[in-house]
Every structure is written in C-alpha cells, then in structure tokens.
Amino acid sequence: CDLPQTHSLGNRRALILLAQMGRISHFSCLKDRYDFGFPQEVFDGNQFQKAQAISAFHEMIQQTFNLFSTKDSSAAWDETLLDKFYIELFQQLNDLEACVTQEVGVEEIALMNEDSILAVRKYFQRITLYLMGKKYSPCAWEVVRAEIMRSFSFSTNLQKGLRRKD
C-alpha cells in the first residue's frame, strides 16, 4: 500500500479547500488564539512504524470529519466548499482503512496504538470545548481552521519522511 503518495495528495487537496474556506479577516481574530496542544509526539516519525502512523492519521481525519460535520460547522462555512472537503476526507479515510488492514491486522493495530489514538481524540476534545466556550463565534472557527491546517501540514511533512523510508 503506497500510503504516503495517495494520502499526501489528498492532504494537499484538503489543505487547499481549508484555505479557501476563510470568510473573515484573520487579523481581527488574533486575540482568540489558543493552545490546543497538538500531540506532535504522536506523529513523530522517529518513534513510529509506518502502520502506527497510518492509524494516527486515520484518527485525525476521522475526528476532522466529525468536527466539520456538525450543524455549527455547516452554519460557519460555505456549503459547496464544505461538501468538497467532506468528499476529500471521506476518500482519505477509505484509502487509510485499506492501508491499515494491509499493513497490519485491525485488532493488532488498535492494541498497538491505543495511546496515540487517545491523544488525537483528546486533542479534538480540546478543540470542541474551545468552540463551545467561544459560542462557535466566527473568530473561533477561524482559529480552529488555522489549527487544522497546521496539523494537516504537519502530517503531510511527516509523510514525505515516510516516503523516503519506503
């Protein structure tokens, strides 16, 4: 399974869509910045086997899909772009699921990577709590959009490293 190639291209497309989704001037939102504590160590290529990385990426995309599928998200973003974003994420989930089962059995990878998946889930919990606390304001969504773009960029960079190791 050539995960890095397919997933990296999908990530780039998702990033482009995220970039296009901005609706308000980012500069008015500076004071809403927040430390979501992106679990960078979970995506550390030095510590990770390819199969474990796939599992963590899968969880991140699943959680991103969940976050942007809420009714509050639908109210915040352009519907056409959001639909395209869903399709991109859904395609990536399918690619990753195929890779997960090909690299290692589903049960094995779930046991092997439970802590990593939990770290990603807690990260998205913090994002959700932040949005709730900010009453899903336009600036809160802008900050979250920027954060998701950064986490996607980070995983894209890691995949380049994984590709070199293949």
Partner: antibody, heavy 121, light 107 residues
C-alpha cells in the same frame, strides 16, 4: 532551513518610489504571515504592518497606514514593502519577519537580515 | 493601541549577575507577550514567546514570566554574549506594539 532573505541596501532621493523585498524559503510560505518592522537610526523597533500571503489580506499600524503598501507574490514566496514618495524621515533599517498567524506558535521566530534605506537629497 | 512600557531603559551589570527587565502593558494582554534580543547591526532574535515559553535554541538562563499587564524577562547568570538591547512585544491584538527597549551594558 528556514530563511528570509531581503533585498539589498537602497539610496534614494526624496519623492522617489521604492519597493523592497523579502523572499522566504525552507517552509510553506502561505502558512505564515509576513510582518514588517522599522528601526530608525539609534531607535527602537516599530511594527509597520503584516500580510497573509495566502490571500494577500493586510493589516497596518495606524502610524504607517497610507504611507506604505505591503504586498506579496506567493508564486515566488516573496513579500514586498513599497513607498510611492519617499521622505528623509523614511531613512531606516527595515526588517521582515514571519508570524504564525492564528496558530499557537512562536511569533516572529525568523527575521530577514534587514534592508537599509537611506533617503537624502 | 496597546502601549508597552519597559523598565529600566538601560542597566549596567557584570558577568554572572542576575538581571531582570520588566514590561507593562496598558491593558490586559493575557500571556501574549514576546521578548527579543538585538545586538548592534543584527536583526532581532526571539527569546521568549507567550510570556514564558523558551524559543528553541535559546539558553535556559533566559526565562519569562507574567500575565495580564505585568511581565518579566530574567537572565539568571549574565554571560558576555548577553550584552545587547532587549525588547518586549505584545501579540494580543493589532496593531502589534513593542516596548522602547532595555539596553544591557557592561558595568
């Protein structure tokens, strides 16, 4: 390696126009904002304005609004600072620096080497 | 605009001294404060971000503290290479603003 490389020193006459540049490399240029900072001879740092290269959205300090124009060309990873009519008081060192935007990350973590602009008749 | 006031504007100290520079904001800026070091003829260098986070590659003798309106930069044991000008800068809201600078000189 992240780098911001600025254009060379300029000597101009009052009333002339000028455009200085700041080229980013070693990182995703559109993922960071680029800010401009002025330092007059023997003085402190003054923030002039900032640009988001992804969509060329800008914000200026009230002190510099209408005095300068900030722009960017993301296709060549370059930000610009320009004057349409220079004054002697524009004589200063100008720095560009990258900013993480709305992300919780270090502000102005990388700086250009500076461009010295001298305006004299 | 948020005004940033640094004190002192200059200080003389010896190698090994503990040095403290303060920065006060005209309104609450939470922890959105950065500290920079600048040496003559060089670009500023980020030392501390978000009030207390040490920038990668910066020696641990530098530390920052504070929140709201009052902030401090501390150099626990001054080294020869630390003689420079230090600036605080708020990143809470636009326009971004710097303090006027504190020059640390050799006694």
């Amino acid at each position: 390696e992240v780098q911001l490389v600025q254009s060379g020193a300029e000597v101009k006459k009052p009333g002339e126009s000028l455009k200085i540049s700041c080229k980013g490399s070693g990182y995703s240029f559109t993922s960071y904002w680029i800010g401009w900072v002025r330092q007059m001879p023997g003085k402190g740092l003054e923030w002039m304005g900032i640009i988001d290269p992804s969509d060329s959205d800008t914000a200026y300090s009230p002190s510099f609004q209408g005095q300068v124009t900030i722009s960017a060309d993301k296709s060549i990873s370059t930000a610009y600072l320009q004057w349409s009519s220079l004054k002697a008081s524009d004589t200063a060192m100008y720095y560009c620096a990258r900013h993480p935007g709305l992300n919780w990350a270090p502000d102005f973590d990388y700086w250009g080497q500076g461009t010295l602009v001298t305006v004299s008749s | 605009d948020i005004q940033m006031t640094q004190s002192p504007s200059s200080l003389s100290a010896s190698v090994g001294d503990r040095v403290t520079i303060t920065c006060r904001a005209s309104q609450s800026i939470d922890r959105a404060l950065n500290w920079y070091q600048q040496k003559p003829g060089k670009a500023p260098k980020l030392l501390i971000y978000f009030a207390s986070s040490l920038q990668s590659g910066v020696p641990s003798r530098f530390s920052g503290s504070g929140s709201g309106t009052d902030f401090t930069l501390t150099i626990s044991s001054l080294q020869p290479e630390d003689f420079a000008t230090y600036y605080c800068q708020q990143s809470f809201d636009f326009p971004l603003t710097f303090g006027q600078g504190t020059k640390v000189e050799i006694k």
